[in-house]
């Protein structure tokens, strides 16, 4: 509450997160033209990345393009990309939607369709839908431990969200345990009124707000965090503005002296931890 | 504008960026003692990295040291590093400029020069100039989509820079389209009075400032972002303070039972998105 | 100092860091059942990661689990994990502490102990103590250059911590050189009253606070940074809240057509650069 006689100071904050959980992933894997059921286990080293700062990312879905190599090939026949003759293909042209540079030739993509030939990582990425349901949908049960150290330098006051009295096997609950800083990912979504299973398909951004409203006067001292949650990406976003949250990364390797890569389009939830508040003192 | 009767509150912000573009890179590649022209395509997975927070990085240039292995070799003969006898080399010494630990011996680096032998990743990195012009100079034509969600918790007000009415094929222009949040990298530099082609060689840091001056009173409501751009690194910086922006990273692999790495010194532009402003309400 | 007649504005800041140093690491390496002394050199590309924003990480210790492959194996026999019959193992169960999913069978881990069989990256990670002393304890002698560009947009004022008159071979010292922005990591710890050698074992988080108290009035202009240091992680933290600072990451590769990984549990110091302060002008 506003105490107008107090000198207010904004919070200086540092955050450290630790995600826990294992996901069991079942998907169709094609090898040597044969499609079979693949089963694998993902642990933290597989689905999250060493990150700094006030964000962490949990991969919930992916599309892989394996064994890509730099060469010439027909581009992917997405809407408006097909051709019937070389006239439709412009040498040196880079279509922002495409993944390569056109050679000027129109070549067969498959038995029925022709597209412009490109110099690219080939075969080019198929623009297929993210798997539904999401491959790592069980990430809903992962937990994250959030450690937050705060400082009001003008008041020379430091504290943290985890107190010595706290129990490391707790789980945050708005009513029953509002000071516990171990959060089940599914609960965060529920609190924000969102459906984890749905968001996991395309990815999204979730805000974890930590609000410190600190009264540092000795006679009425209070300084504990309040947690709240809200979705930060726009779920109603137009296709052209890239809804959800995904990024591409590559694993490079050599085979028969040829540089190859596996391209991974990773969909997932980026959690932004937004710490704010003030410390007031007479 | 300052309305003294209003209660002002600083903005809480979350940013999401998406870079698009392909670069065609032509460079001299030496293999088995033979130098030939190499031609390759770089897409987002090759020139940018999965990053969190209010920054994104676009690689515009690089120097590779391929096939390094942990062994003994002469250090690079940079200024002041040459020797004529073992007396000049001190066993166990780590020169901060060097990349290894001296064995105490002075050995031939090439036909004309001798340097101290070191235990290091060998052959040690050549301290050569960044290629000029920059290898990915065409990154000037890449575009970045910036999504910014802001929140004034005290006023319980949330908005974003992308509105449902916006068109996903726009490009930001200070006069013609100041609300479009898709930016051409070259335009950002032009707006900041900088030369992309020049900065791309050594790298640099560019600030994209998003200023929200929000009047949240219902009778004169206004809350839209204003974009401005300024270079954040010091282009006149002394050599000793490492001008530009670069970092080294490594790709590790095994060959002939020996752990090897390719060291990449990546030069590029780090874009920092600096969101600030206030929400005022009676 | 507080000048009540001034209009105060919070600082907008951008940070760029550059770590320098080499570490010599000696450890026991087991290959083909034979244990021998391993000796290697770590340079910046080995112990730090390309990071954005106001943080950088220096690896000071690690535990490796080499040649893991997705299969079935007994889980690690940590406290409470041993079994004597299949009844103790529940098919499909994922223990958050474990690294896999139980098959329902109780199998021998070694000659004396049995544990539940899991589907996981095998052999599962041994829960052994971080090496003591830390493998990269010599990181104490690494240095970091910190470049900080600040901006007060309302006052249209920009400056940086590195001035043209500064000397790139300086080292920060609270008394003798308080404006030098090259810091020895060991000195940062000493200033914060912490023991680098101790913290290096389990890792930790160290805050580097840069305080700008700027008087922008022309008649008494002053705007230089003040550096201070404090530990941000809780050294007295209960085991259940994961003391120190570590994360796991993996290097993936293929051998005999089988996907394998080396899992690295990296312990280290995350340095958070916390920039704050105000610019005041009449």
């Amino acid at each position: 509450s506003d105490k107008l006689y107090q000198r207010k100071e904004p919070v200086i904050s540092s955050v450290h997160t630790k995600v826990k959980g294992i996901a069991e992933v079942t998907e169709n894997v094609t090898e040597g033209g044969v499609t079979k059921l693949g089963h694998s286990i993902f642990d933290t080293a597989d689905y999250t990345f060493p990150l700094q700062g006030n964000s962490f990312f949990v991969m919930t879905n992916y599309v892989k393009s394996e064994g890509q190599v730099q060469t010439l090939c027909p581009e992917y026949p997405r809407r408006g990309a097909q051709c019937s003759s070389d006239r439709r293909c412009k040498k040196g042209w880079m279509d922002p939607q495409s993944k390569g540079i056109q050679t000027g030739r129109c070549v067969p993509y498959d038995k029925t369709r022709k597209t412009c030939e490109v110099s690219a990582w080939c075969p080019t990425e198929e623009e297929k839908e993210a798997p539904r349901p999401a491959l790592l949908r069980s990430a809903e049960n992962f937990t994250v431990l959030i450690k937050n150290n705060i400082h009001f330098p003008g008041h020379n006051y430091t504290t943290r969200n985890i107190l010595p009295t706290m129990n490391g096997s707790c789980t945050f609950h708005k009513t029953w345990d509002p000071q516990c800083s171990i959060f089940r990912l599914g609960d965060i979504f529920q609190e924000a009124g969102e459906n984890f299973t749905e968001v996991a398909v395309q990815g999204g951004i979730m805000g974890i707000e930590i609000y410190w409203d600190c009264n540092l006067d000795s006679w009425s001292h209070h300084c504990r965090p309040r947690y709240s949650f809200r979705r930060l990406d726009d779920k109603n976003m137009d296709e052209s503005f890239v809804p959800g949250y995904n990024f591409r990364y590559a694993k490079y390797y050599k085979e028969n002296n040829v540089e190859k890569r596996t391209l991974i389009k990773a969909f997932g939830i980026r959690f932004d931890i937004l710490v704010f508040g003030t410390g007031g003192k007479f | 504008s300052d309305k003294l009767y209003q209660r002002k509150e600083p903005v809480i912000s979350s940013v999401h960026t998406k870079v698009k573009g392909i670069a065609e890179v032509t460079e001299n590649v030496t293999e088995g003692g033979v130098t030939k022209l190499g031609h390759s395509i770089f897409d987002t997975a090759d020139y940018t990295f999965p990053l969190q927070g209010n920054s994104f990085f676009v690689m515009t240039n690089y120097v590779k040291s391929e096939g390094q292995v942990q062994t003994l070799c002469p250090e690079y003969p940079r200024r002041g590093a040459q020797c004529s006898s073992d007396r000049r080399c001190k066993k166990g010494w780590m020169d901060p400029q060097s990349k290894g630990i001296q064995t105490g011996r002075c050995v031939p680096y090439d036909k004309t020069r001798k340097t101290c032998e070191v235990s290091a990743w060998c052959p040690t990195e050549e301290e050569k100039e960044a290629p000029r012009p920059a290898l990915l100079r065409s990154a000037e034509n890449f575009t970045v989509l910036i999504k910014n969600n802001i929140h004034f918790p005290g006023h319980n007000y949330t908005t974003r820079n992308i509105l449902p009415t916006m068109n996903g094929s726009c490009t930001f222009h200070k006069t013609w389209d100041p609300q479009c949040s898709i930016f051409r990298l070259g335009d950002i530099f032009q707006e900041a009075g900088e030369n992309f082609t020049e900065v791309a060689v050594q790298g640099g840091i560019m600030g994209i400032e998003i200023y929200w001056d929000c009047n949240l009173d219902s009778w004169s409501h206004h809350c839209r972002p204003r974009y401005s751009f300024r270079r954040l690194d010091d282009k006149n910086m002394d050599e000793s303070f490492v001008p530009g922006y670069n970092f080294r990273y490594a790709k590790y692999y095994k060959e002939n039972n020996v752990e090897k790495r390719t060291l990449i010194k990546a030069f590029g532009i780090r874009f920092d998105i600096l969101v600030f402003g206030t929400g005022g309400k009676f | 100092s507080d000048k009540l007649y001034q209009r105060k504005e919070p600082v907008i800041s951008s940070v760029h860091t550059k770590v320098k140093g080499i570490a010599e690491v000696t450890e026991n390496v087991t290959e083909g059942g034979v244990t021998k002394l391993g000796h290697s050199i770590f340079d910046t590309a080995d112990y730090t990661f390309p990071l954005q924003g106001n943080s950088f990480f220096v690896m000071t210790n690690y535990v490796k689990s080499e040649g893991q492959v997705q299969t079935l194996c007994p889980e690690y026999p940590r406290r409470g994990a041993q079994c004597s019959s299949d009844r103790r193992c529940k098919k499909g169960w994922m223990d958050p502490q474990s690294k896999g999913i139980q098959t329902g069978r109780c199998v021998p881990y070694d000659k004396t102990r049995k544990t539940c069989e899991v589907s996981a990256w095998c052999p599962t990670e041994e829960e052994k103590e971080a090496p003591r002393p830390a493998l990269l304890r010599s990181a104490e002698n690494f240095t970091v250059l910190i470049k900080n560009n600040i901006h007060f947009p309302g006052h249209n004022y920009t400056t940086r911590n590195i001035l043209p008159t500064m000397n790139g071979s300086c080292t920060f010292h609270k008394t003798w050189d308080p404006q030098c922005s090259i810091f020895r990591l060991g000195d940062i710890f000493q200033e914060a009253g912490e023991n680098f050698t101790e913290v290096a074992v389990q890792g930790g988080i160290m805050g580097i606070e840069i305080y700008w108290d700027c008087n922008l009035d022309s008649w008494s202009h002053h705007c230089r940074p003040r550096y201070s240091f404090r530990r941000l992680d809780d050294k007295n933290m209960d085991e259940s809240f994961v003391p120190g600072y570590n994360f796991r990451y993996a290097k993936y590769y293929k051998e005999n057509n089988v996907e394998k990984r080396t899992l690295i549990k990296a312990f280290g110091i995350r340095f958070d650069i916390l920039v704050f302060g105000t610019g005041g002008k009449f």
Partner: nanobody, 120 residues
Framework: EVQLVKSGGGLVQAGGSLRLSCAAS????????MAWYRQAPGKQRELVAD???????NYADSVNGRFTISRDNVRNTVYLQMNGLKPEDTAVYYC??????????????WGQGTQVTVSS
Amino acid sequence: EVQLVKSGGGLVQAGGSLRLSCAASGSFFRVNNMAWYRQAPGKQRELVADITRGDRTNYADSVNGRFTISRDNVRNTVYLQMNGLKPEDTAVYYCYARIELGPLVPRDYWGQGTQVTVSS
């Protein structure tokens, strides 16, 4: 005691081939550069070819394209495959290795020479 144990060598006709091998044995930390040198009667010892631990090779102009140096890092062995031999290749061939007994304790080791004679 570290030793370099060689094998190969002998008499061969011009245009023929020979393969030399040389293995480092004993107790040591790491084998770094390995090389083959040769010394013809009345001449100075000269470098034939060398190979780094990372398999980078370097050849004397006189043998380039005819000789191939390689190594096996598991067996700590260096090989010299000599094709298209000429009478002027006749010499005593010496194996060389730069071996670290312990970290940062390097020593140069030479093998006993092996005679290669190429008859015309």
